[in-house]
């Protein structure tokens, strides 16, 4: 079964900066990647970025930069303007749509005991979109 992994890390140099890394381990070609926070896309989550392999990317604040790292992974830099660092307790979700089989989504958050720069991936939580 294809798997989506999600990894959230706090930047060591700037405690207000976070990066979400997501990747797709599965067959087919990626059609679209959607990153959301606060829950899965379409299920209470808010879109942060949409990345298309050919048409480029769209992002919404507080997302700062969304980019492809490889053909099957992306990263999203976030700028936390609030003093209370809400990202620390936030769930980030990545949804990969692939041709022809469909969409897979997983969510992750910053590990509770994170030191700045720590990037241990959380256990992926696969969310099947339909059945």
């Amino acid at each position: 079964t294809p798997e989506v992994w999600v990894q959230v890390q706090m930047e060591a140099t700037e405690l207000s900066s976070f990066t979400v890394h997501c990747g797709f381990l599965g067959p087919g070609s990626i059609s679209l990647v959607t990153v959301s926070w606060g829950g899965p896309d379409g299920a209470g989550g808010t879109k942060l970025a949409v990345l298309h392999p050919e048409l480029g990317t769209r992002q919404w604040a507080p997302a700062r930069q969304a980019r492809w790292e490889t053909q099957s992974s992306i990263s999203l830099a976030l700028e936390d303007s609030g003093a209370s660092s809400p990202f620390a307790n936030t769930t980030f979700c990545c949804k990969f749509a692939s041709f022809p089989e469909g969409s897979w989504e997983s969510c992750g958050s910053l590990p509770p005991s994170s030191d700045p720069g720590l990037s241990a991936p959380p256990t992926p939580v696969p969310i099947l979109r339909a059945d």
Partner: antibody, heavy 116, light 106 residues
Framework: QVQLQQSGTILARPGASVKMSCRAS????????IQWIKQRPGQGLEWIGA????????RYTQKFKGRATLTADKSSSTAYMQVNSLTSEDSAVYYC?????????WGQGTTLTVSS | QIVLIQSPAIMSASPGEKVTMTCSAS?????IHWYQQKSGTSPKRWIY???KLTSGVPARFSGSGSGTSYSLTISSMEAEDAATYYC?????????FGGGTKLEIK
């Protein structure tokens, strides 16, 4: 229960255009490709193209590029295929299908008859 | 384009008999998918990624192969298995189907 409901039988003249529909229900329509497949009477299956409803991305086989147009209406969870410049070779059953995490769902098929 | 040749075109088997049909690709493909279609109904994907059975498909079905040579096997034929089986590749556009193998019950 995921369902794809296709439009009924269509009778058309050579040279005309037709537009058939495929209405999806009980799944997140925007998340999954809709495939279109042709089957002539007593013959095999032929892939025409596919559309990703979330952003309207399309893929076509070269044979149908320019003559078939795939569209999707997110508000009604309906995919459409328009075929132009019809000939008798277009007389067939046309299926829409979607693959949802390795399970496939098919419409019942739209029968198109092209005759003068 | 990748041409998929299925053989035999038509075959018949008795209940309990082992059945094997083949799908030969004109160029190497990573995977083959098999569809079952009964007369007057929509096709159903039966086997995906060469070896994996779609949910609900009986365990008497199996798929195997690699490169240009693939096969679908029924370990013990049952009456409900009578249908036409198509192989297909998702490797290269156009995503072609084979011509089908019609399996009849004796």
């Amino acid at each position: 229960q995921v369902q794809l409901q296709q439009s009924g039988t269509i009778l058309a003249r050579p040279g005309a255009s037709v537009k058939m529909s495929c209405r999806a229900s009980d799944y997140t329509f925007t998340d999954y490709w809709i495939q279109w497949i042709k089957q002539r009477p007593g013959q095999g299956l032929e892939w025409i193209g596919a559309i990703f409803p979330e952003n309207g991305d399309t893929r076509y086989t070269q044979k149908f590029k320019g003559r078939a147009t795939l569209t999707a209406d997110k508000s009604s969870s309906t995919a459409y295929m328009q075929v132009n410049s019809l000939t008798s070779e277009d007389s067939a059953v046309y299926y829409c299908a979607t693959f949802i995490n390795y399970v496939d769902y098919w419409g019942q098929g739209t029968t198109l008859t092209v005759s003068s | 384009q990748i041409v998929l040749i299925q053989s035999p075109a038509i075959m018949s088997a008795s209940p309990g008999e082992k059945v094997t049909m083949t799908c030969s690709a004109s160029s190497s493909v990573n995977n083959i998918h098999w569809y079952q279609q009964k007369s007057g109904t929509s096709p159903k994907r039966w086997i995906y990624d060469t070896t994996k059975l779609t949910s609900g498909v009986p365990a008497r079905f199996s798929g195997s192969g690699s490169g240009t040579s693939y096969s679908l096997t029924i370990s013990s034929m049952e009456a409900e298995d009578a249908a036409t089986y198509y192989c297909q590749q998702w490797n290269i556009n156009p995503y072609t189907f084979g011509g089908g193998t019609k399996l009849e019950i004796k």
